[in-house]
């Protein structure tokens, strides 16, 4: 498949597989305990550099947070230390181990007699929310062409089943906040916005929480707008040409325009020995313009047959639309047929077979812009 600008832009490298949801450990610690998480290398092989992450954010070592390649210790744990922890390979961001940690108010070794109630809140069946596929949560930036649809997803789990809510730029986000509304699917952990517009740009945060903790993920949405512009002409076209007397020549001009373009081919001429009029605009003659039966494709080519020395000179492809005009020019050099052609001399003369690009400097440092008004003035000179 050929990929165009419509393909999504993401702020991360290619996705890598992570552990299955069943491999995620759910651990309970008491307030004041040391949280110890161990992540041995898979298969006993070399570990390589790793990074420890909590709720999607890299952990910074401190006096209380001790980070090692295979081990994480959080001393004097408090409720705020609850959350989803993972150990990842630094280079690939592959999730090696994933833990759902809950820190309870009572010490984990406490002798709470209310066993029935406690059974509901501790052990492997309970815990703070965690991402079910954390390796899919690394992409943060989404750039989408206007008028398309965006879906943000934050699939999570926990016990009890967490709730999900959405923020835009840090504030509660509801359907009435955008024209066209939003569609929420709590069972799919998703937010959908149809037919996005530039005002939808911003940061979107999903907040997933239950009584044991909260996790969040922020995505940035950019909406790509097609701003109206004057025609764009392909660089390097038309190209300068050198032709032998009596041969045929083609100039090409590739025009890109969202609005309907009007294409003309002009030849620069002299009037009374002058190339420009009193107001400084060039004298031109229109060689080719849109007619009833002319296609854009036909207008993008100017064909000169059986060229004479009079055909030598400067040619301009002029394209205009409702926004404005663009033009590119090229030169035609006509050489005598019988003359033995030599390579360019030190002065830079053009020889047959070479398309020597004549720079703005060569042309005296100025390229004249021919306006629509100029065209009306100089059409028939």
């Amino acid at each position: 498949e050929s990929l165009g600008t419509e393909q999504r832009v993401v702020g991360r490298a290619a996705e890598v597989p992570g552990p299955e949801p069943g491999q995620q450990e759910q651990l309970v610690f008491g307030s004041g305990d040391a949280v110890e998480l161990s992540c041995p290398p898979p298969g006993g092989g070399p570990m390589g550099p790793t990074v420890w992450v909590k709720d999607g954010t890299g952990l910074v070592p401190s006096e209380r947070v001790l980070v090692g390649p295979q081990r994480l210790q959080v001393l004097n744990a408090s409720h705020e230390d609850s959350g989803a922890y993972s150990c990842r390979q630094r280079l690939t961001q592959r999730v090696l181990c994933h833990f759902s940690v809950r820190v309870t108010d009572a010490p984990s070794s406490g002798d709470d007699e209310d066993g029935e109630d406690e059974a509901e809140d501790t052990g492997v069946d309970t815990g703070a929310p965690y991402w079910t596929r954390p390796e899919r949560m690394d992409k943060k930036l989404l750039a989408v062409p206007a008028a398309n649809t965006v879906r943000f997803r934050c699939p999570a789990a926990g016990n009890p089943t967490p709730s999900i809510s959405w923020l835009k730029n840090g504030r509660e986000f509801r359907g009435e906040h955008r024209i066209g509304g939003i569609k929420l699917r709590h069972q799919q952990w998703s937010l959908v916005m149809e037919s996005v517009v530039p005002s939808d740009r911003g940061n979107y945060t999903c907040v997933v929480e239950n009584k044991f903790g909260s996790i969040r993920q922020t995505y940035t949405l950019d909406v790509l707008e097609r701003s109206p512009h004057r025609p764009i002409l392909q660089a390097g076209l038309p190209a300068n040409q050198t032709a032998v007397l009596g041969s045929d020549v083609e100039f090409h001009c590739k025009v890109y325009s969202d609005a309907q373009p009007h294409i003309q081919w002009l030849k620069h001429v002299e009037v009374n020995g002058s190339k420009v009029g009193p107001d400084g605009t060039p004298y031109v003659t229109v060689l080719k313009t849109a007619g009833a039966n002319t296609t854009d494709k036909e207008l993008e080519v100017l064909s000169l047959h059986n060229v004479t020395f009079e055909d030598a000179g400067e040619y301009t492809c002029l394209a205009g639309n409702s926004i404005g005009f663009s033009h590119h020019s090229a030169w035609l050099v006509v050489l005598p047929a019988e003359e033995e052609l030599v390579e360019a001399d030190e002065a830079g003369s053009v020889y047959a077979g070479e398309q020597k690009l004549i720079s703005e400097e060569d042309l005296g440092g100025e390229q004249k812009l021919i306006s629509e008004e100029d065209l009306h003035h100089h059409h028939h000179h």
């Epitope: 600008t5 008028a147 398309n148 943000f152």
Partner: antibody, heavy 127, light 107 residues
Framework: EVQLVESGGGLVQPGGSLRLSCAAS????????ISWVRQAPGKGLEWVGR????????NYADSVKGRFTISADTSKNTAYLQMNSLRAEDTAVYYC????????????????????WGQGTLVTVSS | DIQMTQSPSSLSASVGDRVTITCRAS??????LAWYKQKPGKAPKLLIY???FLYSGVPSRFSGSGSGTDFTLTISSLQPEDFATYYC?????????FGQGTKVEIK
């Protein structure tokens, strides 16, 4: 009002060529894509291909790859389906449909949805 | 290519009936599934996208569900204008593929 109008269908001999047009109006042609879908008489729907006019990026079904070419002229808000080396099995009603993407960071694909369709144009390949 | 199989191929029902059409994918397509309705001689119309999202302007009696390989289109109370052929279509894989269609006829 969003409108898509196909034209260019007709009778053509096997091995021949035909160019279908899809004139779009009522929406920003350069923001979304155009898909072509065909339906043989009495049969189901078959996706033919898709273009995103702004980039010119195209995708085709294997059954038409190398024979059919989709293009677009953004200045005319028109998409085209150039069909060469036509076969009897290409006989069908050809629909063009506005196509938008559902962009989702969580997955590795873009879901494409065809929300507005033209009325269709019949192409008959027969000797 | 991902094969989409609809069942039943046709069904007869009365106005007011609850109708369920299923669509099975030959491999996981996540929720990337759309449902279209087509009347004879007319172009298809989008009903549901992303398995369960009702397209704007479509009556709420239509609903979609499912993910992975098994999907369902439900019409809660069949109306006269609902007698048509329904197609499912996936677009996770290339190419996009349609089911063979389910024709809903008047009993």
């Amino acid at each position: 009002e969003v409108q898509l109008v196909e034209s260019g269908g007709g009778l053509v001999q096997p091995g021949g060529s035909l160019r279908l047009s899809c004139a779009a109006s009522g929406f920003t042609f350069t923001s979304t894509g155009i898909s072509w879908v065909r339906q043989a008489p009495g049969k189901g729907l078959e996706w033919v291909g898709r273009i995103y006019p702004t980039s010119g990026s195209t995708n085709y079904a294997d059954s038409v790859k190398g024979r059919f070419t989709i293009s677009a002229d953004t200045s005319k808000n028109t998409a085209y389906l150039q069909m060469n080396s036509l076969r009897a099995e290409d006989t069908a009603v050809y629909y063009c449909a506005r196509t938008y993407g559902i962009y989702d960071l969580y997955v590795d694909y873009t879901e494409y949805v065809m929300d507005y369709w033209g009325q269709g144009t019949l192409v008959t390949v027969s000797s | 290519d991902i094969q989409m199989t609809q069942s039943p191929s046709s069904l007869s029902a009365s106005v007011g009936d609850r109708v369920t059409i299923t669509c099975r994918a030959s491999q996981d397509v996540d929720t990337s599934l759309a449902w279209y309705k087509q009347k004879p001689g007319k172009a298809p119309k989008l009903l549901i996208y992303s398995a369960s999202f009702l397209y704007s302007g479509v009556p709420s009696r239509f609903s979609g569900s499912g993910s992975g390989t098994d999907f369902t289109l439900t019409i809660s109370s069949l109306q006269p204008e609902d007698f048509a052929t329904y197609y499912c279509q996936q677009s996770t894989g290339h190419p996009q593929t349609f089911g063979q269609g389910t024709k809903v006829e008047i009993k």
